[in-house]
Interface confidence: low
Amino acid sequence: RTRSGSQLDGGLVLFSHRGTLDGGFRFRLSDGEHTSPGHFFRVTAQKQVLLSLKGSQTLTVCPGSVQPLSSQTLRASSSAGTDPQLLLYRVVRGPQLGRLFHAQQDSTGEALVNFTQAEVYAGNILYEHEMPPEPFWEAHDTLELQLSSPPARDVAATLAVAVSFEAACPQRPSHLWKNKGLWVPEGQRARITVAALDASNLLASVPSPQRSEHDVLFQVTQFPSRGQLLVSEEPLHAGQPHFLQSQLAAGQLVYAHGGGGTQQDGFHFRAHLQGPAGASVAGPQTSEAFAITVRDVNERPPQPQASVPLRLTRGSRAPISRAQLSVVDPDSAPGEIEYEVQRAPHNGFLSLVGGGLGPVTRFTQADVDSGRLAFVANGSSVAGIFQLSMSDGASPPLPMSLAVDILPSAIEVQLRAPLEVPQALGRSSLSQQQLRVVSDREEPEAAYRLIQGPQYGHLLVGGRPTSAFSQFQIDQGEVVFAFTNSSSSHDHFRVLALARGVNASAVVNVTVRALLHVWAGGPWPQGATLRLDPTVLDAGELANRTDSVPRFRLLEGPRHGRVVRVPRARTEPGGSQLVEQFTQQDLEDGRLGLEVGRPEGRAPGPAGDSLTLELWAQGVPPAVASLDFATEPYNAARPYSVALLSVPEAARTEAGKPESSTPTGEPGPMASSPEPAVAKGGFLSFLEANMFS
C-alpha cells in the first residue's frame, strides 16, 4: 500500500492494534526518483486500564446530621491496582438537600469539587443534611460523580442518599419533627404547642393529595404524675387517653401543674397515623416520652461566664476546667447544672474519667469542677467548636460554646528541590518548592528564622537583608536569595520553622544554574573525534550579559575519551593536546575536539557518557553544568549532527578512502553534516531529511 506525506500530515493514516502488545510495520520511502532501504516503525500497545465502582452507592443519613462516606458506600478500583490517592472523584452535580465537605478543611467553606478514594477510606468526605423548613418523613438526594484515573476511561456514578426519621439516630433520639419538652412555672399551666411537640413529619409520609384526610393520633400510655393534661379544657384519663396532631396545632393541649414542688414530670405516648374517619392506617409510628420541667417561680437563671479556648496537641488529652466552662448560679449546686452537647467538632470528643472510653454528650458543672471532664484530640489539628446547651433544671436551656484549638504534635519542613539561582542574575526567589511546612495538614501560617546564614550570599525581603520571614512572604515571592560573593557555585543556609507552637529545622541548598546552552544531539560515533563548538556548548549569552569571555574548567569525564585542543592547520606542528580548561573563544574558534572512546571490556554497542564542567564569568557566581551524550559504534551511512574531525582508522581503511578524513584537518565530505536535521514539515519530512541527507 502506498501512503503520501500529505495523508500522514493530515492524520488520515491510522494504526489499528490487534495481536501482541509489541510489533509494528516495515516501510520504504520514495520521492519518485530515489527509494530508501527498508525501515521498521515500532508500535507498542498498552493494556487498557479499566475503572470499576463497587459499594452500595447508597448512604443513609439521620435528619440534620453529618455522615461520612465509607468504602461500603463508594469503593473504586482499577484493573491496574491504582493507588487510591490517584482515583479521583469529581462532583458533577452536588447534593440538593445538604452539602458535601472535607473533614479536615473549613466546614463553612465552598462546596467540595474533587476528592479521592483514599479520602473516602479515611472517612474524611462528609455529607451533611440541612434541615428543611417543611417537615418530611423520608427524603432522597443524589450526587452525580465522575470517577477518573488516567489513562483509564472515566466512569459516571450516582450516589443515592436517603434521609429518614425512621433511622435510629443518636443525635436525634426522637422520631418526631419536634419533641422538645415543656417548661412550666410551679403550680401554673402551660400550653403544649407544635413548637414543643410536632408529629407533622409522620403526616408527610402520606402523599399530599390524601394528607388532609389524615391525622396523627397520640395515645398517652403513661400520664403525668404531678399534673394533668387537658384537651379543649377536658382532662385526659385512662378512659380517654387520646389527642390529635390537629388539636396540638390548634393550641388545644394544655399541661396544668398541681403544685407542691419542682420535680420533673412528663408523659409517655405512642403516635401513629390515623386515616379518614379515624381508621387506623399502616405507616410510621413511634413510642416516646415528653419531658415537662417544673420551674421554681422565684428562681434566678444561671449566668454563663466568659470562656477561654482549650489548646492541646493532636493525639493528646486535656482536662476541661472552669476557665473553659463555668456559670454563676447562686440557686444551684454544680451537680444540678447540666450541659448537653448539641453539636461536636470533628477534631476530637469529650470524655468523662471513669465513664468509659467513648464520647459523652451530657455532663455537669461538678464534672468540670472536679477535673473529670476531658477532651481527647483524636482528629486533625484544626480549631473546632462544641455547641452546648446548659440548664440548671429549672430555667430554659441556654446556648453555650466551647472552642478547642488542636495544635500539631509535630511539623515537618518539606524541601522538594534546592533553590536554583540563574547564573547571570545571581539571585532567585524562594517558593514552596524550597520551604513548606506540614503537620497533618499544610501550615500556611508558618514563620521562619535564620539560624545559620549562607556563606556566599544574603536572604532579602523588600531588598533588605533579613533573618526572619513568613510562609506568606515565600508564597508571594518576596523572599530572595542573592549571591554577594562570586566564588562558589553553591551555598546553603539553615532555618528554624515555627507553626502553631511547634518548631522544626531544615537546611536549604542553593545551586547556581549555568547560563549555558547544551546540545548533544543524536548518538556520537565511538572512536571518532568531534568538534566541540557553539553548536554543542554555548555560553555566548553569558558573555553578552557579563561583558566577559566565559571560562570552562573540566571537573569530570568523559569516562571513555578526552577533551583535546586541535592544531589550527595541518602545517601546525604537534598532535592533539589534552585540555583541562578552555574559553568560549576556544569554542567559537573551533579549537577543541572530543575524542569519543569505546567502552572497554564489553561488546561494541551503544553507551552513555558525560562531561562535568564549571563555568566562570566576570561578576557572577560560577556554575556546574554537564554535557550528557550517547555514543554508538561508528556507522559510515549515518549522518551525524556534529562536525567530525576524524573517524575510526578501521572505518577509513574499509571505505578505501583514506583522504576522506584526516585526524587533524577539516572534515571530509562523507564525515560531516554539521547542521542538525530538523523536521519542519511533519513526520514524513523528518524521515526524508534523515533518510535522504
Epitope: 443513609t60 418530611f136 423520608e138 427524603a139 432522597h140 436517603a162 429518614s164 425512621e166 433511622a167 435510629a168 439516630c169 443518636p170 433520639p173 426522637s174 422520631h175 408527610a204 409520609s205 402523599p207 399530599s208 392506617v281 399502616a282 405507616g283 410510621p284 409510628q285 413511634t286 413510642s287 416516646e288
Partner: antibody
Framework: QVQLVQSGAEVKRPGASMKVSCKAS????????IHWVRQAPGQGLEWMGW????????NYAQKFQGRVTMTRDTSTSTVYMELSSLRSEDTAVYYC??????????WGQGTLVTVSS | DIVMTQSPDSLAVSLGDRATINCKSS????????????LAWYQQKPGQPPKLLIY???TRESGVPDRFSGSGSGTDFTLTIDSLQPEDSATYYC?????????FGQGTRLEIK
C-alpha cells in the same frame, strides 16, 4: 465486621415465658434498629417488631401486642426479646436483624425455641 | 396489613438458565413522594438466616452478584436471576418495607436441574 450473636436454643412449657438475647458488635449499636423475625418449622418469615436501641422506643406487630417485650442494654450492646404465655404454635426459630431503615441487612444466626408439654 | 403473594411456590431451572420469581402486594408500596418502591428480596438456604439481595425493589445490596436484579412498581414485582449457578439453589422471599407490620411473601423454592 457486623455480627449479631444470639443466645442458645430453649425448650419451654406452654404458658411459660422465653427471653432471647442478641449481642451486637462491629458497628455503633445505637445507630441502627434491631427487629425480631420468626420462622416456624417449614414455614415463612414473620415480623414481630422493632426496638430503637438509642431511645428504647419500640413498635410491635398487633399480633404480638401484650405478649412481647423488647428491651436493650446499651452498656453491653445487647437487645432482648421476651415472649410470654407461650403456646405450641410459638415453636420457631427467632432471628434478630439489624436495619437502618426497614430492610434487614444483617441477621443473627437464629435461636430455636420449642414449646412442648 | 399488606399481604404479599409470591408465585410460583417452587420452580426448577437448568444450570446457566434464567429464573424469574414474581411478588404481588395487596396495596401499592410505591411512595409517590420519592417515587421509590419499598420492596426487598431475600435468599435463604437451609439452616441459615435470610440474606438481603435487593431493597427499594431494584437496588442491589453491596456484595450481591450482578446476575441478581429486581424490577417492578406499585404492586407487581419480579426478581430475576441470570445464568443460574449451583449456589443459587435456595428459598427466595419478598418483603414490603413500606409500613408496619412489615410482611413477607410465603417464599419460592428454587431448585437447579
Amino acid at each position: 465486621q457486623v455480627q449479631l450473636v444470639q443466645s442458645g436454643a430453649e425448650v419451654k412449657r406452654p404458658g411459660a415465658s422465653m427471653k432471647v438475647s442478641c449481642k451486637a458488635s462491629g458497628y455503633t449499636f445505637t445507630n441502627y434498629y434491631i427487629h425480631w423475625v420468626r420462622q416456624a418449622p417449614g414455614q415463612g418469615l414473620e415480623w414481630m417488631g422493632w426496638i430503637n436501641p438509642n431511645s428504647g422506643a419500640t413498635n410491635y406487630a398487633q399480633k404480638f401486642q401484650g405478649r412481647v417485650t423488647m428491651t436493650r442494654d446499651t452498656s453491653t450492646s445487647t437487645v432482648y426479646m421476651e415472649l410470654s404465655s407461650l403456646r405450641s404454635e410459638d415453636t420457631a426459630v427467632y432471628y434478630c436483624a439489624k436495619s437502618w431503615v426497614s430492610w434487614f441487612a444483617s441477621w443473627g444466626q437464629g435461636t430455636l425455641v420449642t414449646v412442648s408439654s | 396489613d399488606i399481604v404479599m403473594t409470591q408465585s410460583p411456590d417452587s420452580l426448577a431451572v437448568s444450570l446457566g438458565d434464567r429464573a424469574t420469581i414474581n411478588c404481588k402486594s395487596s396495596q401499592s408500596v410505591l411512595n409517590s413522594k420519592n417515587n421509590r418502591n419499598y420492596l426487598a428480596w431475600y435468599q435463604q438456604k437451609p439452616g441459615q438466616p435470610p440474606k438481603l439481595l435487593i431493597y427499594w425493589a431494584s437496588t442491589r445490596e453491596s456484595g450481591v452478584p450482578d446476575r441478581f436484579s429486581g424490577s417492578g412498581s406499585g404492586t407487581d414485582f419480579t426478581l430475576t436471576i441470570d445464568s443460574l449457578q449451583p449456589e443459587d439453589s435456595a428459598t427466595y422471599y419478598c418483603q414490603q418495607h413500606y409500613s408496619t407490620p412489615f410482611t413477607f411473601g410465603q417464599g419460592t423454592r428454587l431448585e437447579i436441574k
